[in-house]
C-alpha cells in the first residue's frame, strides 16, 4: 500500500461513541468533503498498555461510517488511542487519530419503544436487548415522559436488575378523549446531556372508567 | 518534563465569577484528560470533574452542576475551569491534574487561590 | 457516593521508624473489568498533591521502595519501611472504581 503525505490532519475528522440498544458505536464523519475514500480501517490501542495499533476486524476495509466496538471496548477508565485511515483503493487518503475515555465520551441513545392507548392509561413498552453486559448499564436510569397540553411530567421506573429484555410500563390516571405524547430516554447518574427520543403520540379513546379496565385485561 | 502551570491568586467578589487556566507542557495535551480538584483550607480534597480536551466532553461531579464549566482550548495547551455565582464556600485552593485514565491524576498544577470575600 | 475512611488521623513517627496508614471504603473497589482503581498521594506542606502509589500497589516512577501498597475489596494499607524527613506530610486514599471518585479525609504524618 503506497502512503501518500496525508491531506488531512487529525482535526480532519468527528467523532462520536453512542451507547445504541446497548452496543457501543463509533461514527465519524469527515470535514473535507472533497476527498471521498472507498473504505476505511478502524485501529486501536489502550493507553495503559501502549502495544502495537490492533486491526478491529469487523472495520477492516469498510465502506461504512461506523463501527460496532462492543466486544473490543470493555474499561469506562481506560483510554482508547484510536485511528482511522481512509483509502481510495490502495492509496491511504488520510489518518486521523483520537482518544476515547467511555466515562466521557459516550453519549447515550434513547431505547426503541411502543405506546399503546387506553381510554385512561397508555402501556409504554420499552425494548431492550435480551443480554446487556454490566459494563455497558454505565449507572443508567430510564426516563418516560408524558406530554399533555403543555404539562410535562418525568416517570421513572424501577428497573429490577439491569436493563434487559421487554419492560412495561403503565402511565395511568390519565383523561380519556386527550392527546398524550411520550417520549423515552436514558439518563446518566452525572446528569450529563440526554438524548430524548422523538415523541410518539396517541389520542386517548373517549369511554368509562370500566370499558378501560376490560381492554387492559 | 510533564508540567501543569496554573494562574495565579485570585481575591473575588461574592456574586462573580473566575475562570482558574492550567497549562499543559511536555507531553500531547490531547491524549490525556485534564481532572479538577478542591482542596478548602485546612480540609481535605473534593473531586471536581474532567475534561477530554480532544473531544470538549466533560464529567462532574454532582456537587458542582451550575457551579462549574470546564473547557480546553487545544491550540495553547490549556485547560479551564469557571467557577460562577462565587460565595465564600468557594475559597479554596483549586487544583488541576493529569489523568492517562479515568481518575489517574498522575500530575498536577501547583493550585490556584481563590478567595471569596466582599 | 464510595465514603472513604483513613485511620489514624495524625501518625507521630520517629525518623528510620515504620508507618503504616489504613483506608477502608463503604464499598468494594474491585471494578468489573478485574482492576482495582486504590491510589495514594501525599501532600507535603504548602505543595500541591504528588501521586505515590496508583492501583493499589504500583509505585510511581521515583518514588522510593520504601513505600509499599497493599489491600483488595474495601480495606487497603499504605506502609512506609522507614520513614525519612522527606515522608512528611499529610496523605490520602482515593478510589477511582465509582463515580464520582473520593478522597480519604487524610492522615497527617509528622515528627514525634
Known amino acids: 500500500i503506497s502512503y501518500d503525505s496525508p491531506d488531512y490532519t487529525d482535526e480532519s475528522c468527528t467523532f462520536k461513541i453512542s451507547l445504541r440498544n446497548f452496543r457501543s458505536i463509533l461514527s465519524w464523519e469527515l470535514k473535507n468533503h472533497s476527498i471521498v475514500p472507498t473504505h476505511y480501517t478502524l485501529l486501536y490501542t489502550i493507553m495503559s498498555k501502549p502495544e502495537d495499533l490492533k486491526v478491529v476486524k469487523n472495520c477492516a476495509n469498510t465502506t461504512r461510517s461506523f463501527c460496532d466496538l462492543t466486544d473490543e471496548w470493555r474499561s469506562t477508565h481506560e483510554a482508547y488511542v484510536t485511528v482511522l485511515e481512509g483509502f481510495s483503493g490502495n492509496t491511504t487518503l488520510f489518518s486521523c487519530s483520537h482518544n476515547f475515555w467511555l466515562a466521557i465520551d459516550m453519549s447515550f441513545e434513547p431505547p426503541e419503544f411502543e405506546i399503546v392507548g387506553f381510554t385512561n392509561h397508555i402501556n409504554v413498552m420499552v425494548k431492550f436487548p435480551s443480554i446487556v453486559e454490566e459494563e455497558l448499564q454505565f449507572d443508567l436510569s430510564l426516563v418516560i415522559e408524558e406530554q399533555s397540553e403543555g404539562i410535562v411530567k418525568k416517570h421513572k421506573p424501577e428497573i429490577k436488575g439491569n436493563m434487559s429484555g421487554n419492560f412495561t410500563y403503565i402511565i395511568d390516571k390519565l383523561i380519556p378523549n386527550t392527546n398524550y405524547c411520550v417520549s423515552v430516554y436514558l439518563e446518566h447518574s452525572d446528569e450529563q446531556a440526554v438524548i430524548k427520543s422523538p415523541l410518539k403520540c396517541t389520542l386517548l379513546p373517549p369511554g368509562q372508567e370500566s370499558e378501560s379496565a376490560e381492554s387492559a385485561k | 518534563q510533564v508540567q501543569l502551570q496554573q494562574s495565579g491568586v485570585e481575591l473575588v467578589r461574592p456574586g462573580t465569577s473566575v475562570k482558574v487556566s492550567c497549562k499543559a507542557s511536555?507531553?500531547?495535551?490531547?491524549?490525556?484528560?485534564i481532572e479538577w480538584v478542591k482542596q478548602r483550607p485546612g480540609q481535605g480534597l473534593d473531586w471536581i470533574g474532567m475534561?477530554?480536551?480532544?473531544?470538549?466532553?466533560?464529567k462532574c461531579n454532582k456537587k458542582f452542576k451550575g457551579k462549574v464549566t470546564l473547557t480546553a482550548d487545544k491550540s495553547s495547551s490549556t485547560a479551564y475551569m469557571h467557577l460562577s455565582s462565587l460565595t465564600s464556600d468557594d475559597s479554596a485552593v483549586y487544583f488541576c491534574?493529569?489523568?492517562?485514565?479515568?481518575?489517574?491524576?498522575?500530575?498536577w498544577g501547583q493550585g490556584t487561590s481563590v478567595t471569596v470575600s466582599s | 457516593d464510595v465514603l472513604m475512611t483513613q485511620t489514624p488521623l495524625t501518625l507521630s513517627v520517629t525518623i528510620g521508624q515504620p508507618a503504616s496508614i489504613s483506608c477502608k471504603s463503604s464499598?468494594?473497589?474491585?471494578?468489573?473489568?478485574?482492576?482495582?482503581?486504590l491510589n495514594w498521594l501525599l501532600q507535603r506542606p504548602g505543595q500541591s498533591p504528588k501521586r505515590l502509589i496508583y492501583?493499589?500497589?504500583k509505585l510511581d516512577s521515583g518514588v522510593p521502595d520504601r513505600f509499599t501498597g497493599s489491600g483488595s475489596g474495601t480495606d487497603f494499607t499504605l506502609k512506609i519501611s522507614r520513614v525519612e524527613a522527606e515522608d512528611l506530610g499529610v496523605y490520602y486514599c482515593?478510589?477511582?472504581?465509582?463515580?464520582?471518585?473520593?478522597f480519604g479525609g487524610g492522615t497527617k504524618l509528622e515528627l514525634k
Open positions: 491534574a493529569r489523568s492517562g485514565w479515568v481518575y489517574a491524576m498522575d500530575y
Open positions: 511536555g507531553y500531547a495535551f490531547t491524549n490525556y484528560l
Open positions: 475534561i477530554n480536551p480532544g473531544s470538549g466532553g466533560t
Open positions: 464499598q468494594s473497589l474491585l471494578d468489573s473489568d478485574g482492576k482495582t482503581y
Open positions: 492501583l493499589v500497589s
Open positions: 482515593w478510589q477511582g472504581t465509582h463515580f464520582p471518585q473520593t
